[in-house]
Amino acid sequence: EEELQVIQPDKSVSVAAGESAILHCTVTSLIPVGPIQWFRGAGPARELIYNQKEGHFPRVTTVSESTKRENMDFSISISNITPADAGTYYCVKFRKGSPDTEFKSGAGTELSVRAKPSAPVVSGPAARATPQHTVSFTCESHGFSPRDITLKWFKNGNELSDFQTNVDPVGESVSYSIHSTAKVVLTREDVHSQVICEVAHVTLQGDPLRGTANLSETIRVPPTLEVTQQPVRAENQVNVTCQVRKFYPQRLQLTWLENGNVSRTETASTVTENKDGTYNWMSWLLVNVSAHRDDVKLTCQVEHDGQPAVSKSHDLKVSAHPKEQGSNTAAENTGSNERNIYGGSG
């Protein structure tokens, strides 16, 4: 009679974490009599996974009725697979005796465990940055196996190329992590922009995971200022407006100075939003020209989002008939309240 062979038909088996793994094993003969044992690994450090004869193996069940006399199928199912279960499993036939002795081993089945990556988390810089500056975004995802993974960066659907990615650890592990840093150049139109990190892995079946960051949390668009003089009905009054345009975020404080003296401070409230997500705001002053003997230098000074103040000035000629006129000069940052000047915003 032909000598017994132990057949493990599957060279490798891949299972998703949490599922059950079926490891197939059949023998070609009922002789010699003796039990089957399953081991993870070979050699002196091999671990017993299942013993047909004795022992308690709560995660292991036999696929067929291995207790039947004529049974030659010794396949097993291992439940609730984790990445730590990866390795080569050997089905080993023993010859009955005192003690039982190893007779023949199967060729082994390599079990690999697939684990999904966690949802990518994208984080941006701690401080806001202005257009034309380059900022860094990081993307992290953890807990995946096998190690092979693909990560891409996008800004508003356009793929980015300036990034560096590391998968850790460099050696073998039950699971892996990915960390990527992308560099993004900000533009004035980026308030509504998104940066997206996309992770593709064998466990995701072609449906990648995405993490996003809104550039609205990263960008600061400084305002542009324009001070203009408006003609008014009364001969002795001039309306001067300060147009604060294209700024983000909304946090903004405006101070009017007359000849370097603070006349009024107000905070942007009723702003208008532009299509690109930036804001516009206007503040005005009604100046009683008759109260002034000399020319008046009016300065609109804006402190945006805690940054150093920017300003624009307007020289008001009191001797001349009120006309629309304006000039840009630096303003002083000191002063006191001045009468005969009335203001508002909108």
Partner: antibody, heavy 122, light 112 residues
Framework: QVQLQESGPGLVRPSETLSLTCTVS????????WSWIRQPPGKGLEWMGF???????FYNPSLKSRVTISLDMSMNQFSLKMTSVTAADTAVYYC????????????????WGQGTTVTVSS | DIVMTQSPLSLPVTPGEPASISCKSS???????????LDWYLQRPGQSPQLLIY???NRASGVPDRFSGSGSGTDFTLKISRVEAEDVGVFYC?????????FGGGTKVEIK
């Protein structure tokens, strides 16, 4: 192609601890035994011990009380520590990979590092 | 521990001629699964050892077929059918059945 590279100090003082690291490149740590073998000048080979991918260790009883082998799969490295060294521990130290796929025995030490010479001297 | 004894200690050879090295173990290396866990290694001068034969008679990958291993139980033999100049060095047998793994004392093969 799997390669092994030993690293560590070439000179150790008597009574101190010898520490060597073997870096595995081009292959998997899994399913193999990772061994340390030494060869005193002009003498034969002596097996010191090995570690399996599951962390189980086996040591030569003649050295057991002094030797520790550890495995860092995340760095693809395994290490040897031997305490209380004497001049008799002067040798070329090899790290090696041992195959196992047929039962309780082993199926050949098929990959060796180039060896690192360790001298124990004051 | 299993004691491994090699003979001869030194073996002068003529290129093109056969050569034979003996290795004896203090206990049987034949396991119940039918495998004899004995390896043969060659250490060329200034180099690391190289695996030639495992399980008594299986040639390792890349080893020329002029090397062959035989034997079972406690008596094993390594044969070189036609010695070549590159075969000079020290040949070691090693038992791989149980720990501690033990080596023979080595056989130095040199050209006559």
């Amino acid at each position: 192609q799997v390669q092994l590279q030993e690293s560590g100090p070439g000179l150790v003082r008597p009574s101190e601890t010898l520490s060597l690291t073997c870096t595995v490149s081009g292959g998997s740590i899994r399913n193999y035994y990772w061994s340390w073998i030494r060869q005193p000048p002009g003498k034969g080979l002596e097996w010191m011990g090995f570690i399996y991918d599951n962390g189980r260790t086996f040591y030569n009883p003649s050295l057991k009380s002094r030797v520790t082998i550890s495995l860092d799969m995340s760095m693809n490295q395994f290490s040897l520590k031997m305490t209380s060294v004497t001049a008799a521990d002067t040798a070329v130290y090899y790290c090696a990979r041992v195959r196992a796929y047929s039962g309780i025995g082993l199926d050949g030490t098929d990959v060796w590092g180039q060896g690192t010479t360790v001298t124990v001297s004051s | 521990d299993i004691v491994m004894t090699q003979s001869p200690l030194s073996l002068p050879v003529t290129p093109g001629e056969p050569a034979s090295i003996s290795c004896k173990s203090s206990q049987s290396l034949l396991y119940s699964n039918g495998y004899a866990y004995l390896d043969w290694y060659l250490q060329r001068p200034g180099q690391s050892p190289q695996l030639l034969i495992y399980q008594g008679s299986n040639r390792a990958s890349g080893v020329p077929d002029r090397f062959s291993g035989s034997g079972s139980g406690t008596d094993f033999t390594l044969k070189i059918s036609r010695v070549e100049a590159e075969d000079v060095g020290v040949f070691y047998c090693m038992q791989a059945l149980q720990t501690p793994l033990t080596f023979g004392g080595g056989t130095k093969v040199e050209i006559k």
